[in-house]
């Protein structure tokens, strides 16, 4: 049997899980008592074509309902397990009240209000994210959809649509919630060193500390076997055997264009004359290959105060 759920004091409309031609009559029964459900609209629970309407729903309406489609050749019976829940007291929507998750990835994305097509609703549909009304211009409600412009991971969360069902001159509230997750389309690329520039010379003062950042970008999304590191005279810093010169482990960063980048900082506690003759290589590598930018150190010229 299929399952449907609703909230106490809201409208709930369900469709017979067995499908037949729209012209065939559908009868609904309380499964446990076999009692027929009437079609008269004055009842709180009544049948309308293949739909069963709870206007409004109550917790005690929970149970199994049977629908029978009477066609000339055979009768088809479907069963529907209906559960009516009390409204959650807090903003945390329990899993059992959640419709299917929507996965977004494009720059613009839409979330459809679940089950809305079963109701006689009128625009606008109100949208809430984690219980807060959405008022930013990035969020646009159109018909039964919520459009989100320039989707980011911050847009992930639980989205609730609220609309009004009109029946017999009475309006009933309906709410439905679903999760939205953002799947960023990732790619890996040949590393690009953003700092230091190619064949760069950096000015330093003898006896003073110096630090040089090696930064590179590798694409978008999680990166496997990606690294940035320093070499001194083609030797990794750890093996160079100079305690004054240390490498600070790579930090994850994002660049302005949303690329995933890593940075490693080379720190020299007190620059010596010998350091000026060394070659410093900033290396970036991943499964696509390796790139290096070599830099040299030059003594800073004293400012002439004449």
């Amino acid at each position: 049997s299929k399952s449907s759920w609703g909230l106490e004091n809201e409208a709930l409309i369900v469709r017979c899980p067995q499908r037949g031609r729209s012209t065939y009559p559908v009868e609904w029964y309380y499964s446990d008592t076999n009692e027929s459900i009437p079609t008269q609209k004055r009842n709180r629970i009544f049948v309308s074509r293949d739909r069963l309407k709870f206007l409004p729903a109550r917790v005690e309406d929970s149970g199994i309902y049977a629908c029978v489609i009477r066609s000339p050749n055979l009768n088809k019976t479907g069963y529907l397990n209906v559960t009516i829940h009390k409204k959650p007291p807090s903003c945390n929507i329990p899993d059992y009240l959640m419709y299917s998750t929507v996965r977004g990835s494009d720059k613009n994305f839409k979330i459809t209000c679940p089950t809305i097509d079963l109701y006689n609703w009128t625009a606008p549909v109100q949208w809430f994210k984690n219980c807060k009304a959405l008022q930013e211009p990035r969020f646009r409600a159109h018909r039964s959809y919520l459009f989100i412009d320039n989707v980011t991971h911050d847009d992930e969360g639980d989205y609730t649509c609220q609309f009004t069902h009109a029946e017999n001159g009475t309006n009933y509230i309906v709410t439905a919630t679903r999760s939205f997750t953002v799947e960023e389309k990732g790619f890996s690329m040949f590393p690009v060193i953003t700092n230091p520039p190619y064949n760069h010379t950096m000015e330093v003062e003898i006896g003073k500390p110096a630090s040089i950042a090696c930064s590179a970008c590798f694409g978008k999304g999680s990166h496997f076997l990606a690294d940035v590191l320093w070499q001194i005279n083609k030797t990794v810093v750890g093996n160079f055997g100079e305690a004054r010169i240390q490498e600070e482990e790579g930090r994850n960063e994002s660049s302005s264009n949303d690329m995933d980048c890593l940075t490693s900082v080379l720190r020299i506690t007190g620059v010596t004359e010998k350091d000026l003759s060394l070659e410093y290589d900033c290396l970036a590598l991943n499964l696509h290959g390796m790139i290096r930018h070599t830099i040299r150190l030059r003594r800073k010229q004293p400012i002439d105060h004449r």
Epitope: G186, L225, D227, L285, L287, G289, M290
Partner: antibody, heavy 125, light 107 residues
Framework: QVQLVQSGAEVKKPGSSVKVSCKAS????????IIWVRQAPGQGLEWMGG????????DYTQTFQGRVTITADESTSTAYMELSSLRSEDTAVYYC??????????????????WGQGTLVTVSS | DIQMTQSPSSLSASVGDRVTITCRAS??????LNWYQQKPGKAPKLLIY???SLQSGVPSRFSGSGSGTDFTLTISSLQPEDFATYYC?????????FGQGTKVEIK
């Protein structure tokens, strides 16, 4: 010619560890990354992790993070994959493979161009 | 991770048949697609890289095509030694993921 030769089959108890070796020959070991892939009986290929020997940079896919350690010994041109806390579902053939990109001229396409013969690891109590 | 879906999961064919295997990526992967052949008890062998480039030593009856999300491996005239399992693999984004495999069996 390029060859990757793996260590022999292993039978292990649940909870123990296994270390599989992969000896490379016929090319400059440090210039290429080595990855490890496993294949459970009758199943597809699952990437575990890899290493870039020249820098010792190793990385692991999420499924194996914390349970696998990949190392390389430049002096013997050998890569190792150690998998700990073994369970019965780790019974599989473990392959090492070379990534086709040469780190020193950044030539080549992106693929696993040479593979070891595979090492069957059976986890059973 | 990028999902790779191969179809069919298995097929029966006769020697001399033209065989086509398709691979679909869950997002566009340009032409970063490889095909491997694996025989029972053996390691996979690279057949095609970059969607359509034949690896050296691979017979010319194997060809690959496609870009974006849809790719095809074609064996123009199936030979007895071609009965094996074929895997596609994307190299657009790490980890480089494989399809679930297509087993080519003798009819």
């Amino acid at each position: 010619q390029v060859q990757l030769v793996q260590s022999g089959a292993e039978v292990k108890k649940p909870g123990s560890s296994v270390k599989v070796s992969c000896k490379a020959s016929g090319y400059t070991f440090t210039n290429y990354a080595i990855i490890w892939v496993r294949q459970a009986p009758g199943q597809g290929l699952e990437w575990m992790g890899g290493i870039i020997p020249v820098f010792g940079t190793a990385d692991y896919t999420q499924t194996f993070q914390g349970r696998v350690t990949i190392t390389a010994d430049e002096s013997t041109s050998t890569a190792y994959m150690e998998l700990s806390s073994l369970r019965s579902e780790d019974t599989a053939v473990y392959y090492c493979a070379r990534v086709s990109t040469n780190y020193y001229d950044s030539s080549g396409y992106y693929a696993f161009d040479y593979w070891g013969q595979g090492t069957l690891v059976t986890v059973s109590s | 991770d990028i999902q790779m879906t191969q179809s069919p999961s298995s097929l029966s064919a006769s020697v001399g048949d033209r065989v086509t295997i398709t691979c679909r990526a869950s997002q566009s992967i340009s032409s970063y697609l490889n095909w491997y052949q694996q025989k029972p008890g053996k390691a996979p062998k690279l057949l095609i890289y970059d969607a359509s480039s034949l690896q050296s030593g691979v017979p010319s009856r194997f060809s690959g095509s496609g870009s974006g999300t849809d790719f095809t491996l074609t064996i123009s005239s199936l030979q007895p030694e071609d009965f094996a399992t074929y895997y596609c693999q994307q190299t657009y984004h790490t980890p480089w993921t494989f399809g679930q495999g297509t087993k080519v069996e003798i009819k």
